[in-house]
């Protein structure tokens, strides 16, 4: 049953091209180059693309032909390492060209950046974007693949595939509509939105992955699996665990053709499986491979099968727990995050991981006790204050987010992690808060037996952006802490997480607090961005201000914005009425 | 608790085959291991085949090659299908089950009995 064996290929790129087509398998090359070398210019990647599609083609026409039996680390690296400007834009990086395989993949892997040093990218008018469309569209999209590819270095990429494809239906609709704007715009925001929840969701599946090891990922993947697909029986679901572990260590190991490839083979096989998988597949498997695939990705759970007996019986009062747990323990914690997963819906991915822990680390403990039955027999109570946990903060910060709204809501969670990790950069407190502050209107909406996994699961995605930004430069013991120690704690540990007493107040600088007239022509998401950057050097500054104090200076500085935005002289009403709120400001928070 | 009950027994010429059903309830038993012990007149009850939640089977050499044990999780149910038939086969069938990840082989192990089917191999 095993979807991937394959018989060896005596040219490997031969088979990748020939498995993919032409047109995948340039966009999929370039996306790879693009996530290595992020700061090369466009053009440059083509051309590198264009020289490997050549090759690949001659090693089509002849598998023997010279060079077409090296593996794809090796070519591709090769050709990565004739770029001329390696040491100039890239530093050490250029050192990764003088190691041999596996070893400069590794070293190419390592230095992928989580936030390049790249221009926001700026949303031309629609006409200039139109025009450039129908110019060239190949360019157009190519240069789509490349700017997401090189932003988002561990974005999934079959799934970037897909987006592109969205990316090109939305023009060539839009762009023969009476009004382009209005059609096209909402449909940039929904695919730029969609785009980064997706990067960030991967992000964390590599990070899963490549920090706590396959038998970590392996363990998600089986507590998301028995939760979507309940009535699948274990063993099917341990086989799609396999294939979606093998799929995601080759996309987060840059193997990105093979990724490709092996996840198109894992929906055609959930596809003719469908029967003793999931009754909720039947009109993803009816749409186009992308679609296919993401749309198995993002499916339903199923409905639970009826009548499914108690836990305990098996998994507690069976005379042979520890024989199991002793013959075949990962098998047997497997069993039981499927059977406890399959029955919980409403409970996180992480809680589920969480529960199995404590199973485990019970077992351990007590198979080696002399009455080890006596010792286990009350292992399901220590799951009560587990469960409640997220159930009681999602509770609480609910009803904070349905009082107080979105950017109000992300406002006291600014205050909340700028107190407990003050040494992290104000511009990753500012992204990672309005993240966290996002879990509102995306999971308060939802019913209690869907709020926690909508809630917690996307509150780990966030959290791991703060890691992986954090550890790029890393400035917090209780960052390091809260993010290395437990995959699956790193938010009750964040959350646990009191006001940092051992931070020395930021000095005040005036420069920080003040504004100009280009304010005033910002969206309205930006202006939020610029307030909320001031809440953060505000606490950095002054980290024992109350809410109170904190409140009557932001409500001062709306008030001193909105008033300059509407003077006829915007510039010189910045200038002085900016002089008097930072006086103001200091002495309401005593500074 | 599972409840286990065995048919298909019957009498056979040697050489020819019969095949072995037992239908499970009151659980699903797609995790547990399961297997088919015999015991022949005046004699202690025997191994025959095993099988895991993964359908990885085990058998005894004396019917290695003769018979193959399988499962259908979807109907909960437990076969062994048995070719070749020898005098020396003769018994009463006995399905079992337990609540093991590694099926094992010793009778003592399993938890769960059904109640035989009769099998006679006589020219």
């Known amino acids: 049953r095993g979807v991937f064996r394959r018989d060896a290929h005596k040219s490997e790129v031969a088979h990748r091209f020939k498995d993919l087509g032409e047109e995948n398998f340039k966009a999929l090359v370039l996306i790879a180059f693009a996530q290595y070398l992020q700061q090369c210019p466009f053009e440059d990647h083509v051309k590198l693309v264009n020289e490997v599609t050549e090759f690949a083609k001659t090693c089509v026409a002849d598998e023997s032909a010279e060079n077409c039996d090296k593996s794809l680390h090796t070519l591709f690296g090769d050709k990565l390492c004739t770029v001329a400007t390696l040491r100039e834009t890239y530093g050490e990086m250029a050192d990764c060209c003088a190691k041999q395989e596996p070893e400069r993949n590794e070293c190419f892997l390592q230095h992928k950046d989580d936030n390049p040093n790249l221009p926001r990218l700026v949303r031309p008018e629609v006409d200039v974007m139109c025009t450039a469309f129908h110019d060239n569209e190949e360019t157009f999209l190519k240069k789509y693949l490349y700017e997401i590819a090189r932003r988002h270095p561990y974005f999934y990429a079959p799934e970037l595939l897909f987006f592109a494809k969205r990316y090109k239906a939305a023009f060539t609709e839009c762009c023969q509509a009476a009004d382009k704007a209005a059609c096209l715009l909402p449909k940039l925001d929904e695919l730029r939105d969609e785009g980064k929840a997706s990067s960030a969701k991967q992000r964390l599946k590599c990070a899963s992955l490549q920090k706590f090891g396959e038998r970590a990922f392996k363990a998600w993947a089986v507590a998301r699996l028995s939760q979507r697909f309940p009535k699948a029986e274990f063993a099917e679901v341990s086989k799609l665990v396999t294939d979606l572990t093998k799929v995601h260590t080759e996309c987060c190991h840059g193997d990105l053709l093979e990724c490709a490839d092996d996840r198109a083979d894992l929906a055609k096989y959930i596809c003719e499986n469908q029967d003793s998988i999931s009754s909720k597949l039947k009109e993803c498997c009816e749409k186009p491979l992308l679609e296919k695939s993401h749309c198995i990705a993002e499916v339903e759970n199923d409905e639970m099968p009826a009548d499914l007996p108690s836990l305990a019986a098996d998994f507690v009062e069976s005379k042979d727990v520890c024989k199991n747990y002793a013959e075949a323990k990962d098998v047997f914690l497997g069993m039981f995050l499927y059977e406890y997963a399959r029955r919980h819906p409403d409970y996180s991915v992480v809680l589920l991981l969480r529960l199995a822990k404590t199973y485990e680390t019970t077992l351990e403990k007590c198979c080696a006790a002399a009455d080890p039955h006596e010792c286990y027999a009350k292992v399901f109570d220590e799951f009560k204050p587990l469960v409640e946990e997220p159930q009681n903060l999602i509770k609480q910060n609910c009803e904070l987010f349905e009082q107080l709204g979105e950017y109000k809501f992300q406002n006291a969670l600014l205050v909340r992690y700028t107190k407990k990790v003050p040494q992290v950069s104000t511009p990753t407190l500012v992204e990672v808060s309005r993240n966290l502050g996002k879990v509102g209107s995306k999971c308060c909406k939802h019913p209690e037996a869907k709020r926690m996994p909508c809630a917690e699961d996307y509150l780990s995605v966030v959290l791991n952006q703060l890691c992986v930004l954090h550890e790029k430069t890393p400035v917090s013991d209780r960052v390091t802490k809260c993010c290395t120690e437990s995959l699956v704690n790193r938010r009750p540990c964040f959350s646990a997480l009191e006001v940092d007493e051992t931070y020395v107040p930021k000095e005040f600088n005036a420069e920080t607090f003040t504004f100009h007239a280009d304010i005033c022509t910002l969206s309205e998401k930006e202006r939020q961005i610029k307030k909320q950057t001031a809440l953060v050097e505000l606490v950095k500054h002054k980290p024992k201000a109350t809410k109170e104090q904190l409140k009557a200076v932001m409500d001062d500085f709306a008030a001193f914005v909105e008033k300059c935005c509407k003077a006829d002289d915007k510039e010189t009403c910045f200038a002085e009425e900016g002089k008097k709120l930072v006086a103001a400001s200091q002495a309401a928070l005593g500074l | 608790q599972v409840q286990l009950v065995e048919s298909g027994g019957g009498l056979v010429k040697p050489g020819g085959s019969l095949r072995l059903s037992c239908a499970a309830s009151?659980?699903?038993?797609?995790?547990?291991?399961a297997a088919w012990f015999r015991q022949a007149p005046g004699k202690e009850r025997e191994f025959v085949s095993a099988?895991?939640?993964?359908?990885?089977?085990t058998y005894a050499d004396s019917v290695k090659g003769r018979f193959t044990i399988s499962r259908d999780n979807a109907k909960n149910s437990l076969y062994l299908q048995m070719n070749s038939l020898r005098a020396e086969d003769t018994a009463v069938y006995y399905c079992?089950?337990?609540?093991?990840?590694?099926?094992?082989?010793?009778?003592?192990?399993?938890?769960?009995w059904g109640q035989g089917t009769l099998v006679t191999v006589s020219s």
């Open positions: 079992a089950a337990v609540f093991r990840v590694v099926a094992p082989k010793t009778q003592y192990d399993y938890d769960y």
């Open positions: 099988i895991n939640w993964q359908k990885t089977a």
């Open positions: 009151g659980r699903p038993v797609s995790n547990y291991a």
